[in-house]
Interface confidence: low
């Protein structure tokens, strides 16, 4: 079937752009921050398979270390994450980008999406936590349309510096409780949820405490269902994965749609050495295709016993009568010994179309 020739625009999070090859960029992050390093292909051309290396050792992806072909994220950074990071071409080991990362105990500057300066401690010797921006905490009820990003903030201070934790409906709230994950920016006293869905409705409480006391604030989130709408997708984390030859990989994508969506897992492939058709549409092969039986589908693509040819970009695509939504996933496959081991991209077989 024809799904049109929709242009796919991949949104990018606020991140550090890569330096010119050969340059070393000096970066400082605060403890608890997310270190995000970006290494776009030189000259904007194709980059081929890459590997991220820290202090000479290939980085192993985990729930905290998210490795993609052009981007590296290290969540909840600590002092141990300081070091020399580089992005290299897997085949040639040529260094494409080089970063010197230092993680300090002090909060990082910037990365504050709404540009607010953080409140400074007023110099009180010791004391229980207190709100530094109470006027910014008036809005207790937040009603947002589905698919929007929500940010709750509880700017506070105290001595010693208090800790902040979050509850949803009175229970501990962690990233794994939500398919799209959450961003906890401790230095900004904030909780961020991207692409909210109806199941995110509820009461969110920040708990700020130190040894002298505890304060809390509760916000109520209402997610407005826009009907009808094109499917809403959330990518399960990590969206980009590196796997060892012969292992199993699972990509996870959540689809919300009022109307029964047609869901597909696709893989980008090359045809006669080209990744795009004559009209500029990428070539993809259909791996799985079905009509969802529910309005909230938890969809998975499982790849068993992966080989080099399984590496590349995968798409979770959902289509209903309103429109199309898709999420991209990257898989990098390497040999059993070292993450930097040379990989040769193999041509794909199977039914291919430009989609």
């Amino acid at each position: 079937e024809s799904l049109g020739t929709e242009q796919r625009v991949v949104g990018r999070a606020a991140e550090v752009p890569g330096p010119e090859p050969g340059q070393q960029e000096q970066l400082v992050f605060g403890s608890g921050d997310a270190v995000e390093l970006s290494c776009p292909p030189p000259g904007g051309g194709p980059m081929g398979p890459t590997v991220w290396v820290k202090d000479g050792t290939g980085l192993v992806p985990s729930e905290r270390v998210l490795v993609g072909p052009q981007r590296l994220q290290v969540l909840n950074a600590s002092h141990e994450d300081s070091g020399a990071y580089s992005c290299r071409q897997r085949l040639t080991q040529r260094v494409l980008c080089h970063f010197s990362v230092r993680v300090t105990d002090a909060p990082s500057s910037g990365d504050d999406e709404d540009g607010e300066d953080e409140a400074e401690d007023t110099g009180v010797d010791t004391g229980a936590p207190y709100w530094t921006r109470p006027e910014r905490m008036d809005k207790k009820l937040l009603a947002v349309p589905a698919a929007n990003t929500v940010r709750f903030r509880c700017p506070a201070a105290g001595n010693p510096t208090p800790s902040i934790s979050w509850l949803k409906n009175g229970r501990e709230f962690r990233g794994e409780h939500r398919i799209g994950g959450i961003k906890l920016r401790h230095q900004q006293w904030s909780l961020v949820m991207e692409s909210v869905v109806p199941s995110d409705r509820g009461n969110y409480t920040c708990v700020v405490e130190n040894k002298f006391g505890s304060i809390r604030q509760t916000y109520t989130l209402d997610v407005l269902e826009r009907s009808p709408h094109r499917p809403i997708l959330q990518a399960g984390l990590p969206a980009n994965q590196t796997a060892v030859l012969g292992s199993d990989v699972e990509f996870h994508c959540k689809v919300y749609s009022d109307a029964q969506p047609h869901i597909q897992w696709l893989k980008h492939v090359e045809v006669n050495g080209s990744k795009v058709g004559p009209d500029g549409t990428p070539y993809v092969t259909v791996l799985k295709s079905w009509i969802s039986e529910s309005v909230e589908a938890d969809v998975r693509l499982r790849l068993a016993n992966v080989s080099e040819r399984d590496g590349g970009e995968y798409l979770c695509r959902a289509t209903n009568f309103i429109g199309v939504a898709e999420k991209a996933f990257w898989l990098s496959v390497h040999g059993p010994r070292a993450a930097e081991e040379e990989l040769v991209e193999a041509d794909e077989a199977g039914s291919v179309y430009a989609g």
Epitope: H177, I179, W290
Partner: antibody
Framework: EIQLQQSGPELVKPGASVKVSCKAS????????MYWVKQSHGKSLEWIGY????????RYNQKFKGKATLTVDKSSSTAYMHLNSLTSEDSAVYYC?????????????WGQGTLVTVSA | QIVLTQSPALMSASPGEKVTMTCSAS?????MYWYQQKPRSSPKPWIY???NLASGVPARFSGSGSGTSYSLTISSMEAEDAATYYC?????????FGAGTKLELK
């Protein structure tokens, strides 16, 4: 109508092997993973593993690695489970089950079960 | 592996009575799934993604929970609800089931 039709009961001797079949109908066989589940008499359910009929890829519960082998015949839309070196511990009802229509991690359709009895 | 502990193992309820059974996970899970099984029958899908009723399941059933604590509730017990109910997770390998809660009619 989606149906999973399993083969009949088996009485086998210790040390022997058995092959249980599960014929699928009413849906695109290669579009959904097929799972196998063991239920010992009066006991709970245990996941054995699954096979993706699309590419033959398998994943096993570590406990059943070496005990069970999963295969498919795409031409007949049939999934098979081969159990080897049988002991009395393997006496159970074995179910094939298909995952939910949207790849949820659950079993939306079940076969009627195949009773395997291991006895000398 | 994640162990799912169902309680009570055995319970009985009179028609019209509210019934709640629980499933406790040894580690946090994203979703819980529930199945109903009657003697000499295959399990039937009952509740998926914690709170969604499978096709044909009466509205008197509901599911809830998060993290390590989940429950299945029947608002008003009926004779046909007598069965064994199993919970299941696949947030972590291997996929595991609970030992079951057998619900009898009083």
């Amino acid at each position: 109508e989606i149906q999973l039709q399993q083969s009949g009961p088996e009485l086998v001797k210790p040390g022997a092997s058995v092959k249980v079949s599960c014929k699928a109908s009413g849906y695109a066989f290669t579009s959904y993973n097929m799972y196998w589940v063991k239920q010992s008499h009066g006991k709970s359910l245990e996941w054995i593993g699954y096979i993706d009929p699309y590419n033959g890829g398998t994943r096993y519960n570590q406990k059943f690695k070496g005990k069970a082998t999963l295969t498919v015949d795409k031409s007949s839309s049939t999934a098979y489970m081969h159990l080897n070196s049988l002991t009395s511990e393997d006496s159970a009802v074995y179910y094939c089950a298909r995952e939910g229509g949207n790849y949820e991690a659950w079993f939306a359709y079940w076969g009627q079960g195949t009773l395997v009895t291991v006895s000398a | 592996q994640i162990v799912l502990t169902q309680s009570p193992a055995l319970m009985s309820a009179s028609p019209g009575e509210k019934v709640t059974m629980t499933c406790s996970a040894s580690s946090s899970v994203s979703y819980m799934y529930w199945y109903q099984q009657k003697p000499r029958s295959s399990p039937k899908p009952w509740i998926y993604l914690t709170s969604n009723l499978a096709s044909g399941v009466p509205a008197r059933f509901s599911g809830s929970g998060s993290g390590t604590s989940y429950s299945l509730t029947i608002s008003s017990m009926e004779a046909e609800d007598a069965a064994t109910y199993y919970c299941q997770q696949w947030s972590s390998n291997p996929l595991t089931f609970g030992a079951g809660t057998k619900l009898e009619l009083k």
